[in-house]
């Protein structure tokens, strides 16, 4: 038994659970997902039994080996996978555990504006970046672009303080997860502050 292997996949993609076996005489190999049997292989007779019909077209063993390739990944394929190699030459089955994380490809992040104040010619507000469908494990970065600055800010909330008369600035939210990255539509400080002066309530940008 080796240490737990962490694997990452993307929705619609494929992942291969690598299996290198030194066992000479293999009687059977059993793959399970969250304790539910997934596939049983009996090398002697060349038998592969896929427990659930819906997985039949998603399961493959590339290059004639015993590594499991799972295709057309779905979010709920995330979980613990376990393989047991059974042999009459072994007292205990040889085992390996895997943890699979399946992530979605990120759509464009949405930006909302918080309450805004205009004091002494300075527009002060917060911009909040989020994913519409609440995707998990998303890291947000803000890019503030302008003649006077080119800065990055980590986190989903960007505090803004922009003085009327200053050169315009552009704000872009970048969202990342382990399998994809995307960015929001650009937001101009001047337009943001003009609009917010008319309507002080929180709004979509």
């Amino acid at each position: 038994s080796g240490p737990v292997k962490e694997l990452v996949g993307s929705v619609g993609g494929a992942v291969t659970f690598p299996l290198k076996s030194k066992v000479k005489q293999v009687d059977s190999i059993v793959w399970t997902f969250n304790t539910t049997p997934l596939v049983t292989i009996q090398p002697e007779g060349g038998t592969i039994i896929v427990t659930q019909n819906r997985n039949r077209e998603r399961v493959d063993f590339p290059d004639g080996g015993y590594s499991l390739k799972l295709s057309k990944l779905k979010k709920n394929d995330s979980g613990i996978y376990y393989v047991g190699i059974y042999s009459s030459s072994l007292q205990q089955p040889s085992t390996q555990e895997y943890v699979l994380h399946v992530y979605e490809h990120l759509s464009k992040p949405k930006v909302t504006m918080g309450l805004q104040s205009n004091k002494n010619g300075t527009c002060v507000t917060n911009l909040t970046c989020c994913m519409e469908h609440g995707e998990e494990d998303v890291i947000y970065t803000w890019k503030a672009l302008g003649q006077a600055a080119n800065e990055s800010h980590n986190g989903s909330i960007l505090p803004i303080s922009w003085r009327w008369g200053e050169s315009d600035m552009t704000f872009i939210c970048v969202a990342r997860n382990p399998v994809s990255r995307n960015f929001s539509s650009p937001i101009l400080a001047r337009k943001l502050c003009e609009g917010a002066a008319d309507d002080p309530d929180s709004s979509m940008v």
Partner: antibody, heavy 119, light 107 residues
Framework: EVQLVESGGGLVQPGGSLRLSCAAS????????MSWVRQAPGKGLEWIGE????????NYAPSLKDKFIISRDNAKNSLYLQMNSLRAEDTAVYYC????????????WGQGTLVTVSS | DIVMTQSHKFMSTSVGDRVSITCKAS??????VAWYQQKPGQSPKLLIY???TRHTGVPDRFTGSGSGTDFTLTISNVQSEDLADYFC?????????FGGGTKLEIK
Amino acid sequence: EVQLVESGGGLVQPGGSLRLSCAASGFDFSRYWMSWVRQAPGKGLEWIGEINPDSSTINYAPSLKDKFIISRDNAKNSLYLQMNSLRAEDTAVYYCARPDGNYWYFDVWGQGTLVTVSS
Amino acid sequence: DIVMTQSHKFMSTSVGDRVSITCKASQDVGIAVAWYQQKPGQSPKLLIYWASTRHTGVPDRFTGSGSGTDFTLTISNVQSEDLADYFCQQYSSYPYTFGGGTKLEIK
């Protein structure tokens, strides 16, 4: 010094295969998306595809998806491009490129490796 | 695919002049555009990203502008070392695409 060095180019016959390598140094390779871009003689740049840090996502230009395979080995700080069924129009300088800060524009480029497809 | 069109394959200018290289996207790409310079026999070098932000170390005579479908790279006070090909790139959507390039010639 941040550096990308391509290798593996050369003369190959039509229908043949070739595997290009890109050795990265001077930065944490395992944290970056990486891309391949090619340039036919006297022509513009063409993006081939990209791979994310742990190889779980690979995006290709649709026209090249079925003949090129991008892979990487973070332990070796290396990026690879497997090219199959090569034709004369695949003759180009092939560059590996790193996106600035993991954005979408490329601030580090290799010197390129020339692939010539000819009989 | 989004097509990036650089209508001028060649542009001729003199040292000290100002020159504008244009790039047109076949659909709206916001400000997701970068510009590269490629000198003869060299790899491309990043000049501008997000349409108008200069990359570190790029002289301020290089200026990017535009949004939506029309983009411009302006070189003011052209120097002899600016002799190169210039390419635009969109990264608004997959696949990333480049313009065909504009070769800047110094008279």
